[in-house]
Interface confidence: low
């Protein structure tokens, strides 16, 4: 398990904002947002990046395919960037993650996986802002 | 480049059963599921059922169910679909097809099953 | 089963033409439909997915839209290789059905 303690969560924000929500957001048009209840959270900005590492890259028994899809590719980008050593342990945990999966499949579920996405997306951005905010105070 | 190729033409008699076979290659043949799509002369296209090559867990279609059987050989990457019972209905071009979420991104070429007596 | 119900079943049209060609379930699916295009003797092809997303190599021409229950496809100038019939297909849950076809014909 990557830790992302170290990650320079101020770039990670800038290409979100700049280029992965817009993937996120195209992937989900013609979908309410009030189609799908978020149940997935996420505490704190490392916390966040587990969660969303962990929904965008491993195949779920419902959502198999959102690997290869553009926000995806773009957030493995970012991670790899600004996440020192990202890289090298995602090559180990693909394998094993390979090996384990399991996908008997009644339901899709990618749009529920994605919307939760957003949802700790928009939560990690939260989190950031709450960051700088008590930073601002400290200051003044 | 991904392929799929099945086996060739079989012309059966009602009550028989026929096997085709499907040989992927280019992509890594556990990673995504196979499905079988079938389509009756000048028909649409019908789904017959589903396997998952890296436990052979199988889905079938109710339709099918009790007549079909899908199988796998991981060391050759080769998906089969097999079909007993046959009626003159059965007769179609039967497609395997790859997918991770239900649709369909590469196709077999097809193959001609006759049922006739 | 979710039933879908496409039409036209056939249409005539020119190279030029824009053409569109509407797909509707029994039931919400939310954007979980996918479109094929068959010509005759050969396999079908993909063209979008999740309603709107163009697969690979797929001329831009073609573009899916709708959620729910009502969807389209359409191609905004009709080339002479897009003459076929185009099928769509849910992609929400067993069973995946499909719509019976469209079949697009030289006017």
């Known amino acids: 398990m990557y830790d992302f303690t170290n990650c320079d969560f101020q770039k990670i924000e800038a290409d979100y904002l700049r280029t992965i929500s817009k993937d996120l957001i195209t992937y989900m048009s013609g979908t309410k947002s009030t189609d799908f209840n978020n149940t997935v959270s996420c505490s704190n900005r490392p916390h966040c990046l587990t969660e969303i590492q962990s929904l965008t890259f491993n195949p779920t028994p419902r959502c198999a395919s959102l690997a290869k899809e553009m926000f995806a590719r773009k957030t493995k980008a970012t991670l790899a960037l600004w996440c020192p050593g990202y890289s090298e342990t995602q090559i180990n945990a693909t394998q094993a993650m390979k090996k384990r999966r399991k996908r008997k499949v009644t339901t899709n579920k990618c749009l529920e996986q994605v919307s939760q996405l957003l949802g700790l997306w928009r939560r990690f951005i939260r989190t950031l802002l709450k960051k700088q905010l008590e930073h601002h105070h400290h200051h003044h | 480049q991904v392929q799929l190729v099945q086996s060739g033409a079989e012309v059966k008699k009602p009550g028989a059963s026929v096997k085709v076979s499907c040989k992927a290659s280019?992509?890594?043949?556990?990673?995504?599921?196979m499905h079988w799509v079938r389509q009756a002369p000048g028909q649409g296209l019908e789904w017959m059922g589903v396997?998952?090559?890296?436990?052979?867990?199988?889905t079938y279609n109710q339709k099918f169910k009790g007549r079909v059987t899908m199988t796998r050989d991981t060391s050759t990457s080769t998906v089969y679909m097999e079909l007993s019972s046959l009626r003159s209905e059965d007769t179609a071009v039967y497609y395997c097809?790859?997918?991770?979420?239900?649709?369909?991104?590469?196709w077999g070429q097809g193959t001609l099953v006759t049922v006739s007596s | 089963d979710i039933q879908m119900t496409q039409s036209p079943s056939s249409l005539s049209a020119s190279v030029g033409d824009r053409v569109t060609i509407t797909c509707r379930p029994t039931e919400n699916i939310y954007s979980y439909l996918a479109w094929y295009q068959q010509k005759p003797g050969k396999s079908p092809k993909l063209l979008i997915y999740?309603?709107?997303t163009l697969a690979e190599g797929v001329p831009s021409r073609f573009s899916g839209s709708g959620s729910g229950t009502d969807f389209t496809l359409t191609i905004s100038s009709l080339q002479p290789e897009d003459f076929a019939t185009y099928y769509c297909?849910?992609?929400?849950?067993?069973?995946?059905?499909f719509g019976g076809g469209t079949k697009v014909e030289i006017k």
């Open positions: 280019g992509y890594t043949f556990t990673t995504y599921w």
């Open positions: 097809t790859r997918s991770l979420d239900g649709y369909y991104d590469y």
């Open positions: 999740f309603a709107r």
């Open positions: 396997i998952d090559p890296s436990d052979s867990d199988t």
């Open positions: 297909q849910h992609h929400y849950g067993t069973p995946w059905t």
